[in-house]
Structures are given as C-alpha cells and as structure tokens.
C-alpha cells in the first residue's frame, strides 16, 4: 500500500495473507468459514512453492494469539483467467478446515447486486504490499482510503485506454495506492467486499494509472458455484 | 502556511452567472481534493461540490449539478466555481475548502468566505 | 443521501463546565465523522475527524468519540474562545451533509 498508514490491529478481521513457502505473495480475503477469495494471478508466482493462508494477523513476523496458519485443500482460479490478461483475475482457496472464527477472524459480506458503485466513494484497501517504490516490506498491515473512479474516465486514452471491462472498477492511484504484494486483497465500500486487487504489473501511486479492482458482485454466480 | 483566498462575490441578478475563484498557497495544489461549501445567512453549512486532484472527476450536490461547475488550474494553484441560472435561493456566503489528505470529504483549511446574492 | 441530525440546537454553559454535543447519522457512516466551529463572521474550523482524531492545534479539552451512527463531541473546561457555533458531517462519501449545528453561548 503507497501512502497508506498502519491499520488498527485486528480491525479487518477478514484479512488474510496469502503464503507461498512462509513468504507473503499476495492478499485474500476470507468470504466464508472455509474459503479465501484473492486473485487468480497470485498462483502463477506460486511455482511450485507449498501455498498456505494466514488468517487472524497484524504483523507477519510477530507472535499474535489470533494468528493461525492454514493449508489449502484446493486452488480454484476463475476457469476464464488468463496470464496475460487481468479479466476475471479471481482465485478461491479451500483452506484445509474451517477457520476457527473470533473477534480477529472472520468473514467479510460481498457484494452480490451487480450495480456499480458510486464514483468518488471512498473505500478501504488494505495489505502488506509495498509500502515504496524501492520495494520496501512492511511487517504490519497497512491501509489506504480510494475514492472510486469513474469507468469511462479510468478508460480515457491518457489512464488506462479502454482496458476497464463492466467487471472490472477503479479507484484513484495519486501517491495513493495498492501496490505489489497488495494483489487479491479486498476493496472494500461501507463495510461491503466490493472490488479485489488485480494482479497485473501496473504503475503505482500515479494517477494517470489508476488501480483496477475485480468486481466480485460481476461473479456471484461463480462464486457460489465453487463456495457450494 | 496553508492559505486559501476567494474573490470578491457580490450582488448579481436571477438568471445570470457568476465566477467565483479560490487562490491557494503553502501546499502542493495537485495533492489535494478541493471543494465548495456554502452557507445561507445564519443558517448551516450545505457542500457544494467537489473535485478530485487533477480535475478529471467533479461531485456535486444533485440540486446544482445542472447549473454549478468546479474546475481547477494546478499551473496556477486556483480553484473555480461557475454558477449560472443563479437563483435567489443561492444567496450564501461560499467558502472553498482543502480536503483533508486522508479523509478526503473532511476540510481541514477553509477560505474566508465571499459573499453572493442573487436579488433584482 | 445520508441525514446528521445535531443536539441540542443550542446551548448555555459558563466557562470551566464540560459541554457534549451529539450528531446522529441516519445511516451506519462508520467512523467517518468530522466536527467544525464556527465564530460569528468567520469560516469554520475542522476540529475533529475520523471521529476522535483532533485537527492540528485544537487542544485536547476537545474529544470526538462514538462510531455508526451515534457520535459526540465532548469540550471539558470550556474557555471563552470555545463559544460560537459547532457543526458535524459526515465525510464518508458523497455527498457530505452537515448537521444543522449547534449554537454554544456564554450563560
């Protein structure tokens, strides 16, 4: 997260970390007992590393009593995801057992009506991305407020030309923004899952480039296919 | 030091327009949400509107979407507000306003306010 | 659009009492709330935001607390330059409504 500041520990309980060989990769999102949403993306710089989900955590490195490590039973990226592409850029984890659930696990609603949302609402992203552009790591969670952006000018010739689907949102990127290690993470409006980081290799923190979230309500259907 | 500066308002007729401008100093212009609050004489404070960091999205209040415009110069750090159909109802006192920068609707430095009244 | 309803409309109170004034929003707004003050003939003043953060230089007789849709703004001690007019908004997105404020006199 660029320009983000630290979260209030254990206030976004549905946070999760998404872990290839006890590294964090990429950011999820716990939408059930059992499954954590991110994106499709994060498997490719998985290799064959062994992918595992942490749940209940502020700090990465730190012992915290809500912390829970979790393996995955199951990997199902969206079947329409491609590697060169960011459409339909979702991936669901079956963790191995239920989560045992608390004030700092938990599941976060998603939005299943399939309406825009307004532009210039504000939203909350949050991760353990980069927190600069030389690439620095933060230990503790960080967060950042977006106001959403308008599709038709996220699609100007000058921002990002056209490349926006209707299953696809952005919020605004100046100095502010998710960044690398932020992908699969949630968008969330008034406490609603709404949009998930895309993984591409996108700018940060420019505002010609504004970031580009996944609309989960454009794949409720999918969702619940899997989640069933 | 944060400084934001509107120009001179003043009396104008119903059906006509009106240019206002805010001239800001001791911040990095393009940094920032700016807006346009207004307040009726002895009444509360109603936001007008409000324009993101390179003036490429505006938000206005839905009564005045029609009539009201907020653009802004980053090269000459001013904020604008163009009224047009003025009606006697938009008589106020019209503040331009930063946007705090993390909160983005909080203001956290106001101008001093200029005044406009819409009577024949 | 989301309503904030203040109370009271007005207040007596003496120098070195402890006033609190509440905002309601008709709607869960979170944590999104800002409090301004207002003197007579002058533009306002952001006092508190994200509900009980203080604006630089407000001094700390000021607190904002509560979330969703219940909120107050607390002033212990009051001094002769706290009087004057206090208003709350939401600014948890568009549009951001102000409540119809709060009138604080010297008693």
């Known amino acids: 997260i660029l320009g983000g500041r630290e979260a209030e520990a254990h206030a976004r309980p549905y946070m999760a970390s998404v872990q290839v060989n006890g590294e964090h990769l990429c950011g999820g999102v716990l939408v059930a007992e059992q499954w954590v949403l991110s994106a499709a993306h994060c498997l490719e710089d998985a290799a064959d590393g062994k992918v595992q989900v942490l749940l209940g955590a502020h700090s990465l490195s730190q012992p915290e009593p809500s912390k829970r490590l979790y393996d995955v039973l199951r990997a199902v990226p969206h079947p329409d995801s491609r590697p060169d592409t960011i459409d339909h850029d979702l991936l669901l984890l079956q963790l191995s057992e239920k989560a045992t659930l608390g004030p700092a696990v938990r599941p976060l609603p998603w939005q299943r009506v399939d309406r825009d949302v307004e532009p210039g609402t504000l939203c909350d992203v949050a991760g353990w991305g980069i927190v600069s552009h030389a690439g620095r790591r933060p230990d503790r969670l960080q967060h950042v407020l977006l106001p959403v952006l308008d599709r038709a000018t996220c699609n100007r010739r000058t921002h990002h030309d056209g490349a926006i689907t209707q299953r696809m949102m952005c919020a605004e990127s100046n100095r502010r923004d998710s960044c690398k290690g932020d992908s699969g993470g949630p968008l969330v409006c008034g406490g609603v899952l709404e949009g998930v980081v895309t993984s591409g290799s996108r700018v940060c923190g420019n505002r010609k480039k504004p970031g580009i979230y996944t609309r989960v309500a454009s794949y409720a259907a999918w969702i619940d296919s899997v989640l069933a | 030091e944060v400084k934001l500066v509107e120009s001179e308002g003043g009396l104008v007729q119903p059906g006509s327009s009106m240019k206002l401008s805010c001239t800001a100093s001791g911040f990095t212009f393009s940094d920032y949400y700016m807006a346009w609050v207004r307040q009726v004489p002895e009444k509360g404070l109603e936001w007008v509107g409000n324009?993101?960091?390179?003036?490429?999205?505006?938000y206005y209040l839905d009564s005045l979407k029609s009539r009201f415009i907020i653009s802004r110069d980053s090269a000459k750090n001013i904020l604008y507000l163009q009224m047009s159909s003025l009606k006697s109802e938009d008589t106020a006192t019209y503040f331009c306003a930063r946007g705090e920068d993390f909160y983005l609707y909080a203001m956290d430095y106001w101008g001093q306010g200029t005044s406009v009244t819409v009577s024949s | 659009d989301i309503q904030m309803t203040q109370s009271p409309a007005s207040l007596s109170a003496s120098v070195g009492e402890t006033v609190t004034i509440t905002c309601r929003a008709s709607?869960?707004?979170?944590?999104?709330l800002a409090w301004y003050q207002q003197k007579q003939g002058k533009s306002p003043q952001l006092i508190v935001y994200n509900t009980k953060t203080l604006a630089e230089g407000v001094p700390s007789r000021f607190s904002g607390s509560g979330s969703g849709t219940q909120f107050s703004l607390k002033i212990n001690s009051l001094q002769p330059e706290d009087f004057g007019s206090y208003y709350c908004?939401?600014?948890?997105?568009?549009?951001?409504?102000f409540g119809g404020g709060t009138k604080l006199e010297i008693k």
């Open positions: 908004q939401h600014h948890y997105g568009i549009p951001p409504t």
């Open positions: 709607e869960n707004i979170h944590s999104y």
């Open positions: 324009i993101n960091y390179d003036g490429s999205s505006t």
